[in-house]
């Protein structure tokens, strides 16, 4: 049980890191292709992982202008990196009732990133609220 909770913590630390990558990309929002992308909001309970995968699948792209192309492309690539599998993620994969990615409202990059960040924060909040007190190393 301890190693499973440590695995969950490590996983959530990855989510924590993704928030910083989203924040980094928000600095370069004017250098992103102004395309409308599916952006889940007010995601229903137990559909968080489904919504997360929608954000990861979205075609966020650099507009290939200026000096920021490299950092933008690296950041997008890191956002799309598959997180380590967890029991919570596996359980949610079997839910067939979650909305499809295409059913979510499409938003420009700025709002897309804001909604992605909100979802990540919600997932961390749920994780930290559901476990006993003690640090990520305990």
């Amino acid at each position: 049980h301890k190693s499973s909770s440590q695995g969950q913590d490590r996983h959530m630390i990855r989510m924590r890191q993704l928030i910083d990558i989203v924040d980094q990309l928000k600095n370069y929002v004017n250098d992103l292709v102004p395309e409308f992308l599916p952006a889940p909001e007010d995601v229903e309970t137990n559909c968080e992982w489904s919504a997360f995968s929608c954000f990861q699948k979205a075609q966020l792209k650099s507009a290939n202008t200026g000096n920021n192309e490299r950092i933008i492309n690296v950041s997008i690539k890191k956002l799309k990196r598959k997180p380590p599998s967890t029991n919570a993620g596996r359980r949610q994969k079997h839910r067939l009732t979650c909305p499809s990615c295409d059913s979510y409202e499409k938003k420009p990059p700025k709002e897309f990133l804001e909604r992605f960040k909100s979802l990540l924060q919600k997932m961390i909040h749920q994780h930290l609220s559901s476990r006993t007190h003690g640090s990520e190393d305990s």
């Epitope: 913590d9 490590r10 959530m12 630390i13 924590r16 890191q17 910083d20 990558i21 924040d23 980094q24 690296v74 950041s75 890191k78 924060q121 961390i124 909040h125 930290l128 640090s135 990520e136 190393d137």
Partner: antibody, heavy 116, light 107 residues
Framework: QVQLVQSGAEVKKPGASVKVSCKAS????????MHWVRQAPGQGLEWMGT????????IYSQNFKGRVTMTRDTSTSTVYMELSSLRSEDTAVYYC?????????WGQGTLVTVSS | DIQLTQSPSSLSASVGDRVTITCRAS??????LNWYQQKPGKAVKLLIY???RLHSGVPSRFSGSGSGTDYTLTISSLQPEDFATYFC?????????FGGGTKVEIK
């Protein structure tokens, strides 16, 4: 147990560069990002930036952009912070800090004095 | 950038006292608020993360609370080793920012 051991104090002239190291042990080095924070004499804490040791990805504070470079050496589990074009106001204690859900473990600090 | 205003900037207290330090953010930080302890010549220590979670090895006399923009660190019964400077830090948005610190001194 988690330990972050930083390099020793440095004295530098204005315009020079300084490179501070932070050697990590007691955990999987590539699992946690490392942040750098500084504290000028009698002042508060100021965030400088962060590095992901798994791939050298960095995010820098706008206050230091163009002057700071963070790197890592996975073979020795060490991260480095180099600050260039030093000025007297860069005199401070520089800290590395591991980031989990917060800056959960800190190095002992490295005093960098910039003086002509 | 998110500003964090800590108060008081210093306080004098006696062993056994209950001490409360507050941290106000310039915008809602959704509980992404951490508290640290700093002693001269020692490594900074994390006390509380995500508003109220006690870090490993931290005595239970330390507690945190709050939401939105207002957060509190409480030491229920001050011990001799608690005389130090305390900082809050927000983890909601880059750049990471810190409060100005609260120095807890012996009365």
């Amino acid at each position: 147990q988690v330990q972050l051991v930083q390099s020793g104090a440095e004295v530098k002239k204005p315009g020079a560069s300084v490179k501070v190291s932070c050697k990590a042990s007691g955990y999987t080095f590539t699992d946690y990002w490392m942040h750098w924070v500084r504290q000028a004499p009698g002042q508060g804490l100021e965030w400088m930036g962060t590095i992901d040791p798994s791939d050298n990805y960095t995010i820098y504070s706008q206050n230091f952009k163009g002057r700071v470079t963070m790197t890592r050496d996975t073979s020795t589990s060490t991260v480095y912070m180099e600050l260039s074009s030093l000025r007297s106001e860069d005199t401070a204690v520089y800290y590395c800090a591991r980031y989990g859900f917060a800056m959960d473990y800190w190095g002992q600090g490295t005093l960098v004095t910039v003086s002509s | 950038d998110i500003q964090l205003t800590q108060s008081p900037s210093s306080l004098s207290a006696s062993v056994g006292d209950r001490v409360t330090i507050t941290c106000r953010a310039s915008q809602d930080i959704s509980n992404f608020l951490n508290w640290y302890q700093q002693k001269p010549g020692k490594a900074v220590k994390l006390l509380i993360y995500y508003t109220s979670r006690l870090h490993s090895g931290v005595p239970s006399r330390f507690s945190g609370s709050g939401s939105g923009t207002d957060y509190t660190l409480t030491i229920s019964s001050l011990q001799p080793e608690d005389f130090a400077t305390y900082f809050c830090q927000q983890g909601h948005t880059l750049p990471r920012t810190f409060g100005g610190g609260t120095k807890v001194e012996i009365k």
